[in-house]
Interface confidence: medium
């Protein structure tokens, strides 16, 4: 079942799924002047089974100029640069393996992609939130949502975060932070503060987590 | 609540452009595609064209190249620009909102609707 809406938005914060869950789907959007393929998919589906998941269909981009061009998957360094700061996204990490049994991992980038990505999340989805740069978070409580079903409807949990306007930042050591986008909503999913995984295991992010996943663009 | 509200129909001549909008309102659309169908009479309700929050848009054969479909995020409008216009073109058209990603939606499917607005050309 899909989520009805977006995550929460928090002001001054941004937040970010460290893996999808099968279902998800990421729509195939290219950056202006380029279009997806008239034979291209629509969009990226996480499948899999109970030892794997995946990411079904590749996106594939096609100058608006050029008709029959197909041109596709590993941008060059210039382009990787275009990509907004607010997308947090782990180029290093494998396209078809995630932590958690069920769940797919950030999908690779593709030539001329959009600035933006826009996933689609299904119930039982957890994103994570962090403070922005030049903020800091003041209430640590899970700084996490979940999309819930209840009574027929979906609904995103709220997260315990308030990110306020200090120049001490709540970052871990060597990390660097997205920043805000223009319209002070997540441009796509961002990094985050930790407290549960899907498993409600609890977990200390500085000790448990690699910081690769928080890098805020592509290497 | 969710209103979808379609202006901009109205009688032309073939050969003629016209362009529809519809005004979305109730929540927000970003996770949402905006899409046009039409109906004319006797018919089935028929998929013309859709475009996601990122402008990505997907086109039925039978309007491609005559029908342009765009979008306002600020003002969550659609906006359908048909030229070269013809008598078969002749129906009610319909705005519609379908959560999930840019495809051809089926008419059942939909999430919400718009009432609709009359388009007739004469030949």
């Known amino acids: 079942e899909l989520c009805d809406d977006d995550p929460p938005e928090i002001p001054h914060a941004t937040f970010k799924a460290m893996a999808y869950k099968e279902g998800t789907m990421l729509n195939c959007e290219c950056k202006r002047g380029f279009r997806r393929i008239k034979s291209g998919s629509l969009y990226m589906l996480c499948t899999g089974n109970s030892s794997h998941s995946s990411w079904d269909n590749q996106c594939q981009c096609t100058s608006s100029a050029t008709r029959n061009t197909t041109k596709q998957v590993t941008p060059q360094p210039e382009e990787q640069k275009e990509r907004k700061t607010t997308e947090m996204q782990s180029p290093m990490q494998p396209v078809d393996q995630a932590s958690l049994p069920g769940h797919c991992r950030e999908p690779p980038p593709w030539e001329n992609e959009a600035t933006e990505r826009i996933y689609h999340f299904v119930v039982g989805q957890m994103v994570y939130y962090q403070c922005v740069q030049g903020y800091r978070a003041l209430h640590r409580g899970p700084a996490e949502s979940v999309c819930k079903m209840t009574h027929g409807k979906t609904r995103w949990t709220q997260p315990q975060l308030i990110c306020t306007g200090e120049m001490e930042t709540s970052q871990f050591p060597g990390e660097e932070k997205p920043q805000a986008s223009p319209e002070g909503r997540p441009e796509s999913e961002t990094s985050c503060l930790v407290t549960t995984t899907d498993f409600q295991i609890q977990t200390e992010m500085a000790a448990t987590m690699e910081t690769s996943i928080f890098t805020t663009e592509y290497q | 609540q969710v209103q979808l509200q379609e202006s901009g129909g109205g009688l032309v001549q073939a050969g003629d452009s016209l362009r529809l909008s519809c005004a979305a309102s109730?929540?927000?659309?970003?996770?949402?595609?905006l899409a046009w169908y039409r109906q004319a009479p006797g018919k089935e309700r028929e998929f013309l064209a859709a475009?996601?929050?990122?402008?990505?848009?997907f086109y039925a054969n039978s309007v491609e190249g005559r029908f342009t479909i765009s979008r306002d995020n600020p003002k969550n409008t659609v906006h359908l620009q048909m030229d070269g216009l013809k008598p078969e073109d002749t129906a009610v058209y319909y705005c519609?909102?379908?959560?999930?990603?840019?495809?051809?939606?089926?008419?059942?499917?939909?999430?919400?609707w718009g009432q609709g607005t009359q388009v007739t050309v004469a030949s």
């Open positions: 109730g929540r927000s659309f970003r996770n949402y595609i």
């Open positions: 519609a909102a379908d959560r999930g990603p840019v495809r051809p939606v089926l008419a059942p499917d939909v999430d919400y």
């Open positions: 475009i996601s929050w990122l402008d990505g848009t």
